[in-house]
């Protein structure tokens, strides 16, 4: 059976520019090495913004210099997304793959539509 | 029959260990048969039962390529075999030109 | 896959089909190959165009029955098409469906 993979259709970063939000996955498998990418896509263009494999029952690694953070709770991923300004408001997928041990398994959420206002600069004060 | 091969696919123009990559084979007059896939760090592998204990796959990140070494050759690998890239959301969106290996006797 | 071949006419509309044995949810592409090259991506997702494709291709379906339809036949659509599920390993490929002038 395929994977099936669940996130919230919208969410509204903070006024710092942080977007959360849970990505569930049914998994078909018992596998011990899951793979986490969120894609952004623009238009019909679709780019990675970041990704981490994690071991089952082990935290959720990001690269030192990524814009995402995340923990992990049985088939449940929270993402945290940083860095954000209203340029960046689209649709954030959720991709979600068993790597191991084979059969390999794919699972892509319908996306997650981030909405980034950019905060009012402080007028001068006299 | 019987011998050994390496085929290799140098890729270019994108981040190369952000993509899995397949090899796929098409016999002469035949249809595409899916070969073997590696994955990002060319930790995680997998092959088509018709190739399993013979052939293995590997790539090398830093010089953006990726390699199939073929042991015991048989009359039925004889195929053009096609290194494809991943795209993000799963299927194959670029195909090498491809390389014909034939298997005689 | 069926049909194996379908002979059709340029402006003809062309309609293929391909069934999995279990469901695949919409992890399924379909692929166009003409003689001596290499295949080209045409849909995913079951029915998103990749970068490119003309809008006379369109594909539907989900779980175990998909199609991939062609409004008019151009006369560079006569090809070898293949459908291919991408959810799980093994990364299977339909037996393909030739499409050629009448």
């Known amino acids: 059976k395929a994977m099936h993979v669940a996130q919230p259709a919208v969410v509204l970063a903070s006024s710092r520019g942080i977007a959360s939000f849970v990505c569930e996955y049914a998994s078909p498998g018992k596998a011990t090495e899951v793979r986490v990418t969120v894609l952004r896509q623009a238009d019909s263009q679709v780019t990675e913004v970041c990704a981490a494999t994690y071991m089952m029952g082990n935290e959720l690694t990001f690269l030192d210099d990524s814009i995402c953070t995340g923990t992990s709770s049985g088939n449940q991923v929270n993402l945290t997304i940083q860095g954000l300004r209203a340029m960046d408001t689209g649709l954030y997928i959720c991709k979600v793959e068993l790597m191991y041990p084979p059969p390999y398994y794919l699972g892509i959420g319908n996306g997650t539509q981030i909405y980034v206002i950019d905060p009012e600069p402080c007028p001068d004060s006299d | 029959p019987g011998r050994s091969l390496r085929l290799s696919c140098a890729a270019s123009g994108f981040t190369f260990s952000s993509h899995g990559i397949h090899w796929v084979r098409q016999a002469p007059g035949k249809g595409l048969e899916w070969v073997a896939v590696i994955w990002y760090d060319g930790r995680n592998k997998d092959y088509a039962d018709s190739v399993k204990g013979r052939f293995t796959i590997s790539r090398d990140n830093s010089k953006n390529t990726l390699y199939l070494q073929m042991n015991s050759l048989r009359a039925e690998d004889t195929a053009v075999y096609y290194c494809?890239?991943?795209?993000?959301?799963?299927?194959?969106?670029?195909w090498g030109q491809g390389t014909l290996v034939t298997v005689s006797s | 896959q069926s049909p194996g071949t379908l002979s059709l006419s340029p402006g003809e509309r062309a309609t293929l089909s391909c069934r999995a044995s279990q469901s695949v949810s919409s992890y399924l592409a379909w692929y166009q190959q003409k003689p001596g090259q290499a295949p080209r991506l045409l849909i995913y997702g079951a029915s998103s165009r990749a970068t490119g494709i003309p809008d006379r291709f369109s594909g539907s379906g989900s779980g175990t029955d998909f199609t991939l339809t062609i409004s008019r036949l151009e006369p560079e659509d006569f090809a070898v098409y293949y459908c291919?599920?991408?959810?799980?390993?093994?990364?299977?490929f339909g037996p393909g469906t030739k499409v050629d002038i009448k």
């Open positions: 291919q599920q991408y959810g799980r390993s093994p990364f299977t």
């Open positions: 494809a890239r991943v795209a993000p959301l799963g299927p194959l969106d670029y």
